[in-house]
């Protein structure tokens, strides 16, 4: 029975040209995490195998950095990076857990304006 839950950074926004950290955390299970995959819509960005470490897709290696931890850092953001990102935890013996993050990349002035009027 799968008892685990994935906590994510949820819906996040970032400035065009900046960077953002995508983070997920698996809790409430004793299952062994064997691999974490990071996907953007239908594309695989990177994998982190518990033993073999990180393997970044060549299509993204210039703008994706591993970590911190099992997270993923996206750099030199463009408006086209807006969309859904998924962390997929492959575990033993539970199986697969999936977390979702929605990233919105904003023009610099819009991001600054939004931050100024955020409700605490």
């Amino acid at each position: 029975m799968m008892t685990g839950t994935i906590e994510t950074t949820g819906n996040i926004s970032a400035e065009k040209g900046g960077s953002i950290i995508l983070q997920c955390h698996l809790s409430s299970t004793t299952a062994q995490v064997t691999q974490v995959n990071w996907e953007q819509q239908d594309q695989l960005l990177a994998i982190c195998n518990a033993d073999l470490g990180w393997h970044i897709s060549p299509s993204f290696k210039d703008r994706v950095a591993p970590g911190p931890g099992l997270g993923l850092t996206l750099q030199s953001l463009t408006v086209n990076d807006t969309g859904e990102y998924f962390c997929i935890y492959h575990t033993y013996p539970d199986g697969t857990y999936t977390g979702r993050i929605f990233l919105e990349v904003l023009e610099s002035s819009v991001a600054e304006h939004g931050a100024r009027f955020q409700i605490p």
């Epitope: 691999q35 995959n37 994998i47 195998n49 073999l52 470490g53």
Partner: antibody
Framework: EVQLVESGGGLVQPGGSLRLSCAAS????????MSWVRQAPGKGLELVAT????????NLADSVKGRFTISRDNSKNTLYLQMNSLRAEDTAVYYC???????WGQGTTVTVSS | DIQMTQSPSSLSASVGDRVTITCRAS??????LAWYQQKPGQSPKLLIY???TRQSGVPSRFSGSGSGTDFTLTISSLQPEDVATYYC?????????FGGGTKVEIK
């Protein structure tokens, strides 16, 4: 030049044990996860075991769990596979492999037969 | 576990021919696929990773394509030194699994 040299294979009776070694050179051994992959005679490839660069995490194929142990000594640049309770179906060439399978050793042959 | 199925299991072609080997995954593996070449009496050698990226030193006549469940390894102009068995491997999820291999011979 990356080199992976396996040793320790041989003929062993069913139920016996063997310890395979893989001497690595030409790269920073302690920075790479490592694997053992085997190939039964005339057959395909099977990933047997993997180990983290630091040695702190390992994974074994279901077919060898409880019988095989993978370990490493980063001070000696050496990877090991301890094989116990050997069965006829463990007969294969065993390859030592670096990281995401970019370099393979020449293999060492294990034959389990009475 | 993800099953990897290669076809054909063997083929014979003439020098200079275009050769295509296919690999099918039992579920979506995105582009987490590698191809290996194993010449007779030798250990496997990495040819292609991430479905389409050639490993350093691999001749340009080798190319990989595909995404999801269907993948292809193409040898644009078969050479005598390409006689080997070719394997695909998925690394989308553990345990990583290999296809059964495709043996390529020269007519």
């Amino acid at each position: 030049e990356v080199q992976l040299v396996e040793s320790g294979g041989g003929l062993v009776q069913p139920g016996g044990s063997l310890r395979l070694s893989c001497a690595a050179s030409g790269f920073t051994f302690s920075s790479y996860g490592m694997s053992w992959v085997r190939q039964a005679p005339g057959k395909g490839l099977e990933l047997v075991a993997t180990i983290k660069s630091s040695g702190g995490s390992t994974n074994l194929a279901d077919s060898v769990k409880g019988r095989f142990t993978i370990s490493r000594d980063n001070s000696k640049n050496t990877l090991y596979l301890q094989m116990n309770s050997l069965r006829a179906e463990d007969t294969a060439v065993y390859y030592c492999v670096r990281g995401y399978f970019d370099y393979w050793g020449q293999g060492t042959t294990v034959t389990v037969s009475s | 576990d993800i099953q990897m199925t290669q076809s054909p299991s063997s083929l014979s072609a003439s020098v200079g021919d275009r050769v295509t080997i296919t690999c099918r995954a039992s579920q979506d593996i995105k582009t987490a696929l590698a191809w290996y070449q194993q010449k007779p009496g030798q250990s496997p050698k990495l040819l292609i990773y991430w479905a389409s990226t050639r490993q350093s030193g691999v001749p340009s006549r080798f190319s990989g394509s595909g995404s999801g469940t269907d993948f292809t390894l193409t040898i644009s102009s078969l050479q005598p030194e390409d006689v080997a068995t070719y394997y695909c491997q998925q690394y989308y999820s553990t345990p990583y699994t290999f296809g059964g291999g495709t043996k390529v011979e020269i007519k």
